[in-house]
């Protein structure tokens, strides 16, 4: 599966939300929905 980035400091990776430290940066993309800052 693809990897999805979030503004709030976690990412969707292998279908799970995993915290990461660095700032995400760009939030360009489609709003996934029912998440925090999730775009793809």
């Amino acid at each position: 599966d693809a990897e999805f980035r979030h503004d709030s400091g976690y990412e969707v990776h292998h279908q799970k939300l995993v915290f990461f430290a660095e700032d995400v940066g760009s939030n360009k993309g489609a709003i996934i929905g029912l998440m925090v800052g999730g775009v793809v």
């Epitope: 599966d1 799970k16 709003i31 029912l34 998440m35």
Partner: antibody
Framework: QVQLVQSGAEVKKPGASVKVSCKAS????????IHWVRQAPGQGLEWMGF????????NYNQKFKGRVTMTRDTSTSTVYMELSSLRSEDTAVYYC??????????????WGQGTLVTVSS | DIVMTQSPDSLAVSLGERATINCRAS??????????LNWYQQKPGQPPKLLIY???KQGTGVPDRFSGSGSGTDFTLTISSLQAEDVAVYYC?????????FGGGTKVEIK
């Protein structure tokens, strides 16, 4: 106003494929992912996956093991969900839906009217 | 995958009385102090409608009699004073991780 309008009911034979469409209007098509949720008769809700009209990237529920494909046509603001190798258990109403993220000042959901797919020999 | 379990399967409540529906997740649906737990109402022949998101926040246009509580793995939807138009099936859903998953539903009827 935001609208998601789905294609009409389908009757398919086991082993066949079905392609359901969801035409979006009333907002910028590429700004929201479109999700697909199905509901077998008298049963609960099951999330199938989503596709991004912006990037074309999709994320699928692995339960469908490669049988599902979600695509989009930005020229017509339409998303498609194709399900292959149909079996009787795939008989269901298929919904497309759009959701806001929860960090918005408001959260709304929009749903298509549903498409009944009947799989029968 | 996260499994969502609702109870009861159905309940009958008198008009004006309180209805309480429970939802349990097989693992925590919290992340960064947010519960990714949502509640939907579905009436016959209609698509679902989002009532509550992030466990406690009301969706747009949802009446104040609907409220949500809980965190981690245990959540509750409360209808404080049941109205005739509240007869429906209610579903919980987690959006913490993919695949999103729903509870089996709770049918609310008038006693």
């Amino acid at each position: 106003q935001v609208q998601l309008v789905q294609s009409g009911a389908e009757v398919k034979k086991p082993g066949a494929s079905v392609k359901v469409s969801c035409k979006a209007s009333g907002y910028t098509f590429t700004t929201y992912a479109i999700h697909w949720v199905r509901q077998a008769p008298g049963q609960g809700l099951e999330w199938m996956g989503f596709t991004s009209p912006y990037s074309g990237v999709s994320n699928y529920n692995q339960k469908f093991k490669g049988r599902v494909t979600m695509t989009r046509d930005t020229s017509t603001s339409t998303v498609y969900m194709e399900l292959s190798s149909l079996r009787s258990e795939d008989t269901a109403v298929y919904y497309c839906a759009r959701f806001d993220n929860i960090d918005r000042g408001y959260v709304r959901d929009y749903w298509g009217q549903g498409t009944l797919v009947t799989v029968s020999s | 995958d996260i499994v969502m379990t609702q109870s009861p399967d159905s309940l009958a409540v008198s008009l004006g009385e309180r209805a309480t529906i429970n939802c349990r997740a097989s693992e925590s649906v919290d992340n960064d102090r947010i519960s990714f737990l949502n509640w939907y109402q579905q009436k016959p022949g209609q698509p679902p409608k989002l009532l509550i998101y992030a466990a406690t926040k009301q969706g747009t246009g949802v009446p104040d009699r609907f409220s949500g509580s809980g965190s981690g793995t245990d959540f509750t939807l409360t209808i404080s004073s049941l109205q005739a138009e509240d007869v429906a099936v209610y579903y919980c859903q987690q959006s913490k991780e993919f695949p999103w998953s729903f509870g089996g539903g709770t049918k609310v009827e008038i006693k």
